[in-house]
Interface confidence: medium
């Protein structure tokens, strides 16, 4: 597969209410189960149909979960992370990292599993700057007419 895959990385706080069958998603990851190379973080691998997460609609497959009820998920064994979710109570607050694909180019390949991405400001700032330069140039051109 050729081409570079770039991502906008955004974070979101998602508050879920545990449903009759729980929170309704699966996870992979942990210090003993690094699925993403060089990253022992916890990732959402399945959203179960009609579960609490699916009905809420914000959590997506591939999201990285940074914390549960304020507790950081860094450097946890896989089963310890699972237990943290299972013991999280009725109302569960998740801090999650979404990755939105923004570009496919022919310059190498980042790899689908690589969690690194482009912060949103790194895309928006150059776009804003270009827009301002174009507007300035247009105004100068109109003045010359």
């Amino acid at each position: 597969m050729n081409g570079r895959v770039d991502y906008l990385v955004t974070e979101e706080e998602i508050n879920l209410t545990r449903g009759p069958s729980g929170l309704g998603f699966n996870i992979v990851g942990g210090t003993d189960q690094q699925y993403v190379s060089n990253d022992s973080g916890i990732y959402v691998s399945r959203i179960k149909e009609n579960g609490a997460a699916a009905l809420d609609g914000r959590l997506q497959e591939g999201d990285k979960i940074l914390s549960v009820n304020g507790q950081d998920l860094k450097n946890l064994l896989h089963q310890d992370a699972v237990d943290l979710f299972r013991n999280a109570g009725y109302a569960v607050s998740l801090r999650v990292q979404h990755r939105l694909q923004v570009q496919n180019g022919p310059i190498g390949h980042r790899g689908e599993g690589d969690p690194s991405g482009i912060p949103i400001f790194m895309v928006l700032v150059p776009v804003f700057a270009l827009t301002m330069v174009a507007a300035w140039a247009f105004m100068r051109y109109r003045q010359q007419l």
Partner: nanobody
């Protein structure tokens, strides 16, 4: 997120062998290795039934009693492909065989058996006829 295409079906004599393949096209930003994969079959006039499954990591496999000892499920994550090798085929193995996928990993709610739960994505099926 996942499109599945099965191949390898056909007409085979009783006692023969077949290898079914299922190639997955995974949405960008996802990886095939995150999905549990399964094979199901549906004979004419019967309900679709579980045949075999393999966990997302490949570390666990599950088989229906009807095919245990005669079939082997395997996966090649580099090729986005899951296989079902079927040996000593019987006329009662005649069916449309479907490949299925669902996100793997561990449920944050409760432990479960890969072979027993509903799957999220399905292929169109490949016909296997044992004469």
């Amino acid at each position: 997120h996942v499109q599945l295409v099965e191949s390898g079906g056909g007409l085979v004599q009783a006692g023969g062998s077949l290898r079914l393949s299922c190639v997955a096209s995974v949405a960008s930003g996802r990886t095939f290795g995150w999905y549990d994969m399964g094979w199901f079959r549906q004979a004419p006039g019967k309900e679709r039934e579980f045949v075999a499954a393999i966990s997302w990591s490949g570390g666990s496999t599950y088989y229906a009693d009807s095919v245990k000892g005669r079939s082997t499920i395997s996966r090649d994550n580099a090729k986005n492909t899951v296989y079902l090798q079927m040996n000593s085929l019987k006329p009662e193995d005649t069916a449309v065989y479907y490949c299925a996928a669902r996100g793997g990993g561990t449920s944050v709610d409760s432990d479960y058996d890969v072979g027993e739960f509903e799957y999220d994505y399905w292929g169109q099926g490949t016909q296997v006829t044992v004469s």
